[in-house]
């Protein structure tokens, strides 16, 4: 069976990715776009979150608007707000099924029953992570087939944000805690009947010889 | 201050051509994209070409109506786009406009180019 | 090829009305959308970039919206010296054509 160690270690990996979860779902910066214009003081930054958009003009003054509506988002924003809201919450449930089945907690008597419920929390946590991976690195894919499409204009590229290096690192260490935990072995203790039974049955054996 | 000064426009010959100059000021030329967009008299604004910068390798793009009939060109180190306008026909007759970056953020005052016999 | 088709052709407006106008474009182009505004004898000035961001010294009354193939560009309390031809464009994108126009005349 896994050490405490390692199941301390995988639940607290698995927390900090969900925490990141949470923070690149947050963060207005999943796309940058530096608007350069040729009269340096209408250069603007753009940043694109999942529920707002923020202008940083040339001055340094920001201004932040929340989306008017699901329509105001981009298509792959929307399908990731969708993901990364799941992965929140799929999260969360791994996060409860790792305290019922954490070996320093009474939830579960059955020492059997807790290795289990660490192995379901540790498949959830893989799932989760797997989930903030994909709208991420699409996003990612869809910034970097633009920066090298000779149809876009120079000066007008779109750059990855913050929040995809977050999201990056949420997944990661998703899947790394999720692994940890699915190390957890059930424990192979023999059943008591079974050990009398064999017991009885080698007795009788050697009363027949 | 930005400015952007076109040349080269006036009267030509129906099948004739023109070549058209834009020189500009006040920012980093060789950093942003040129276009050129016309406007016949009356009528909205239709964008003819634009010419990306070196690290684009200088992509140029055109409205697919006038790609066999325009060419454009750039000299970073004169600050200078061009223009160049075969085979000309009378509706080509249009107020000719330089512009910088994308979106076109700032415009010249535009030169007059008319074709008629 | 790309086709951007604003409505209305034109619309006479009272000073203090609220305006809004219209920009279809052909197939998705995203929020890759810029608003001009042209007054008689002048040269086009950029108002909106990417749908729904003002230009720099543009007045907070101007708001763009829209995402996909369909956009607005809404002027609230109209002044007089709104009355030009606005035209939307497609932008980031070649080809980097212009809608027909909509002419906003003060009534």
């Known amino acids: 069976m896994a050490s405490m160690g390692l199941q301390v270690m995988g639940i607290a990996l698995a927390v900090l990715g969900w925490l990141a979860v949470m923070l690149c779902c947050a963060l207005p910066m999943w796309r940058v776009t530096a608007f350069i214009g040729s009269n340096i003081v209408t250069s603007q930054t753009i940043w694109e979150g999942l529920w707002m958009n923020c202008v940083v003009q040339s001055t340094g003054q920001m201004q932040c608007k929340v989306y008017d509506s699901l329509l105001a988002l981009p298509q792959d924003l929307q399908a990731a707000r969708a993901l990364v809201i799941i992965s929140i919450i799929v999260a969360a449930l791994g996060v409860l099924l790792s305290v019922v089945g954490g070996k320093c907690t009474n939830c579960l008597e059955d020492e059997s029953a807790k290795a289990k419920t660490m192995i379901v929390a540790g498949v959830v946590f893989l799932l989760a992570g797997l989930m903030v991976i994909v709208p991420v690195s699409w996003t990612a894919h869809n910034i970097i087939q633009d920066f090298y499409n000779p149809l876009v204009a120079s000066g007008q590229k779109r750059e990855m944000g913050a929040s995809l290096y977050v999201g990056w690192a949420a997944s990661g260490l998703l899947l790394l805690g999720g692994g940890l935990l699915c190390c957890n072995c059930p424990p192979r203790t023999d059943k008591p009947y079974s050990a009398k039974y064999s017991a009885a049955r080698s007795a009788a054996a050697s009363n027949y010889v | 201050e930005v400015q952007l000064v076109e040349s080269g426009g006036g009267l030509v010959q129906p099948k004739g051509s023109l070549k058209l100059s834009c020189g500009a000021s006040g920012f980093g030329f060789s950093s942003y994209a040129m276009s050129w967009v016309r406007q016949a008299p009356g009528k909205g604004l239709d964008w003819i070409a634009t010419i990306s910068i070196k690290t684009q390798n200088y992509a140029t793009h055109y409205a697919e109506s006038l790609k066999e009939r325009v060419t454009i060109s750039r000299d970073d180190s004169q600050s200078m786009v061009y223009l160049q306008m075969n085979n000309l026909k009378t509706e080509d007759t249009a107020f000719y406009y330089c512009?910088?970056?994308?979106?076109?953020?700032?415009w010249g005052q535009g030169v007059m180019v008319t074709v008629s016999s | 090829n790309i086709v951007m088709t604003q409505s209305p052709k034109s619309m006479s407006i009272s000073v203090g009305d609220r305006v809004t106008m219209n920009c279809k474009a052909s197939?998705?182009?995203?929020?890759?959308i810029a608003w001009y505004q042209q007054k008689p004898g002048q040269s086009p000035k950029v108002l909106i970039f990417y749908a729904s961001y003002r230009f720099t010294g543009v007045p907070d009354r101007f708001t763009g919206g829209g995402y996909g193939t369909d956009f607005t560009l809404i002027i609230n309390s109209v002044q007089a010296e709104d009355a030009a031809f606005y035209y939307c464009?497609?932008?980031?994108?070649?080809?980097?054509?212009f809608g027909a126009g909509t002419k906003l005349d003060l009534k």
């Open positions: 464009q497609r932008i980031y994108n070649s080809p980097y054509t």
């Open positions: 512009t910088v970056n994308i979106p076109f953020d700032n």
């Open positions: 197939q998705n182009v995203g929020n890759n």
